[in-house]
């Protein structure tokens, strides 16, 4: 049809802390580069119907459904969704397309369904139906990669079973210790499956989609390493694949590699070799032992042997179902106002978890170390010296780990009050808690130093939020005490705060700090 | 349960000679390697030797040429032979059979 208009459909996602992203449905700014919806003619449908493909969006997610008309003249047009009209402003761009938007903010299920646009332009009438749906992420898995053997070739497939599909890529690194981390110059990325390269020193295999990024490392014993103290220890669970490479380097050719399982040699068929001259001449070995698919009976110490270097073993466990060993007896800690401190907590766990730090309801990002014994640490600075109740949390498939701290900061007490018509009362957070005295200012007394000890009522209660003890002491008004000032004081070992009250003054009652 | 029992150490004098032993029961003594390490005070522990299965002898570079490691299927028990020692070899000796430890035994070299 000639007086068709040339139309183009489009899905524009906002990143969520988008501040451009406006309430009309107007034109917010772009924030991401648009994806193309198509915007086919349905066939079979009375009148012109275009269909925008399915758009899929994440919950709490920002995007903008956008048509480009270009038609001559003028465009008028309406939004209908769930039988209820929106309003619709269109406007032109530069090269004088039509543009009409819908901006749908922090997507729920109410805002999942069919949305309509009908335009009119002075050539003809039609229609673009969207259809907007929330992803099911509770479909979604990302699953830690393992490896397989290529068939018939000396290669490494790595294989992650997620959903959606992953991007795999291996991280490979040929130097030791730290220059290894994720962002070093020493680290080489591959976004692919398979692996040919198999010498380096570090290889890591990782997966990621929009659960996020999940990797494995290739369990390496380095024979022309010095024997550790602690026997490296891999965990498995019953029906996960078996890998661990032995490698090592010799001046020449003349040594061989073998693996035995608690002193038996290793089947064939559970073993393959390869080798290769390095760029100084020096030969390379490595060694696979791998098991396709353990079973309990596959624990043991698994050791591999050179004629010219040192044996060396590793403990491999099977175990039934993943675990998280570590102590979770809360901790108390009291600190300075400037001390430099970390909570950490030190761990054993298979599969790896995934970790928080929270703080009065706000959660911050958990790093964790492995350490040469085969344990785990995840340390937490960034407490700002507020003190509380710190609460870090670990899970993996199998398991849930939780452990509390508590965050107590050494410091001189300061005192707030208020006062009523019965009473007085003192507040203060210093730690350690403080201890009160009350005093009556008079003439016989003009440095208030009359001690009251009748009426007297101290106690400590838990500020909730943060898990922090304020301590409060109120006087009852007695007729002694009426008109007169009092003090009251706070102190601890590292100093004294005071507030002076007039007591049944008349309107609000006056407060003199008093350090 | 794997036991390993270290003896022989003692007070020498530098340049003088020790002899460490290690005897284990518990354990299939002639199917495993054995590793000599030491700690000394303030240190990290350190491997020293290690003999095979099959007799081959390994050594760390600070100790070749002077130490000999020997073992004796029969008895159960690995030595190590200790010669020119220096007064950097003042540490507590220990014997390792995989994941499992003796208690060790002192060596003092001080004039």
């Known amino acids: 049809n000639q007086d068709l208009p040339v139309i183009k459909c489009v899905l524009i996602n906002h990143k969520n802390n988008d501040s451009s992203v406006g309430k009309s449905s107007s034109y917010p700014m772009v924030s991401e580069s648009p994806e193309d919806l198509g915007c086919a003619l349905r066939p079979q449908s009375s009148g012109t119907v275009y269909e925008a493909a399915a758009v899929e969006v994440d919950v709490s997610a920002s995007i903008t459904l956008q048509v480009l008309v270009d038609a001559p003249g003028n465009i008028s047009c309406l939004w209908v969704f769930k039988h209820s009209s929106l309003n619709c402003q269109p406007h032109f761009d530069l090269q004088n397309r039509g543009v009409v938007s819908m901006v749908i903010l922090k997507m729920t299920e109410t805002q999942a369904g069919e949305y309509l646009l009908f335009i009119q332009s002075e050539a003809t009438n039609y229609t673009i139906l969207f259809t907007v749906s929330i992803r099911n992420t509770l479909l979604y898995t990302l699953r830690r990669p393992y490896f397989r053997k290529m068939e018939n070739q000396d290669a490494l497939v790595c294989i992650s079973e997620s959903v959606p599909e992953p991007i795999v890529e291996w991280v490979l690194c040929d130097s030791q210790g730290e220059s290894c981390k994720e962002e070093s110059p020493a680290v080489v990325k591959k976004e692919e499956k398979v692996l040919h390269e198999l010498f380096g020193t570090d290889i890591r295999c990782c997966a990621r989609n929009e659960l996020g990024r999940e990797c494995t490392r290739l369990f390496t014993i380095d024979l022309n390493q010095t024997p550790q103290t602690t026997l490296p220890q891999l965990f498995l669970k019953v029906g996960e694949p078996l890998w661990i490479r032995c490698k090592a380097v010799h001046v020449n050719h003349g040594f061989g590699l073998t693996w035995e399982l608690e002193n038996k040699a290793l089947e064939e068929g559970n073993y393959f070799e390869m080798s290769t001259y390095s760029t100084n001449r020096t030969m390379i070995r490595i060694l696979f032992a791998f098991v396709s698919s353990v079973a309990r009976n596959d624990t043991g110490y698994y050791t591999c042997s050179s004629s010219k270097h040192p044996s060396q073993s590793a403990l491999v466990t099977i175990v039934e179902k993943g675990f998280i060993n570590a102590t979770n007896s809360s901790e108390d800690y009291e600190i300075d106002q400037y001390e430099e401190f970390c909570f950490s907590v030190r761990f054993k766990a298979y599969p790896q978890i995934r970790c928080t730090w929270t703080f009065s309801r706000k959660s911050f990002p958990c790093e964790q170390k492995g350490l040469d014994n085969g344990y785990s640490i995840s340390k937490f600075c960034n407490h700002k010296h507020q003190p509380g109740e710190y609460i870090f949390h670990a899970e993996n498939d199998d398991a849930q780990f939780t452990k509390m701290f508590t965050l107590n900061i050494r410091r001189k007490p300061q005192v707030l009050a208020e006062a009523s018509a019965s009473q007085a009362s003192c507040f203060s957070d210093g730690y350690p808690l403080p201890s009160w005295t009350w005093k009556k200012c008079s003439d016989k007394s003009p440095n208030c130093t009359e001690e009251i000890t009748e009426g007297v009522w101290n106690r400590k209660a838990n500020r909730k939020v943060f898990g922090q003890w304020v301590s409060s002491s109120t006087l009852n008004m007695s007729e002694a005490i009426k008109g007169f000032l009092v003090k009251c004081c706070a102190y601890n070992s590292l100093g004294t705060s005071c507030e002076t009250i007039l007591l049944n003054s008349p309107g609000p009652f006056p407060f003199i700090q008093d350090n | 349960q794997v036991q390993l029992q270290e003896s022989g150490g003692g007070l020498v004098q530098p340049g003088g000679s020790l002899r460490l032993s290690c005897a284990a029961s518990g354990v299939t003594f002639s199917i495993s390697y054995i590793d000599w390490y030491r700690q000394a005070p303030g240190n990290e522990r350190e491997w020293v030797a290690q003999?095979?299965?099959?007799?081959?002898?390994f050594y760390a570079d600070s100790v070749k040429g002077r130490f000999a490691i020997s073992r004796d299927n029969a008895k159960n028990t690995v030595y190590l032979q200790m010669n020119s020692l220096k007064p950097e070899d003042t540490a507590v000796y220990y014997c390792?059979?995989?994941?499992?430890w003796g208690q060790g035994t002192q060596v003092t070299v001080s004039s």
């Open positions: 390792r059979i995989l994941s499992y």
């Open positions: 003999i095979t299965r099959g007799g081959d002898s």
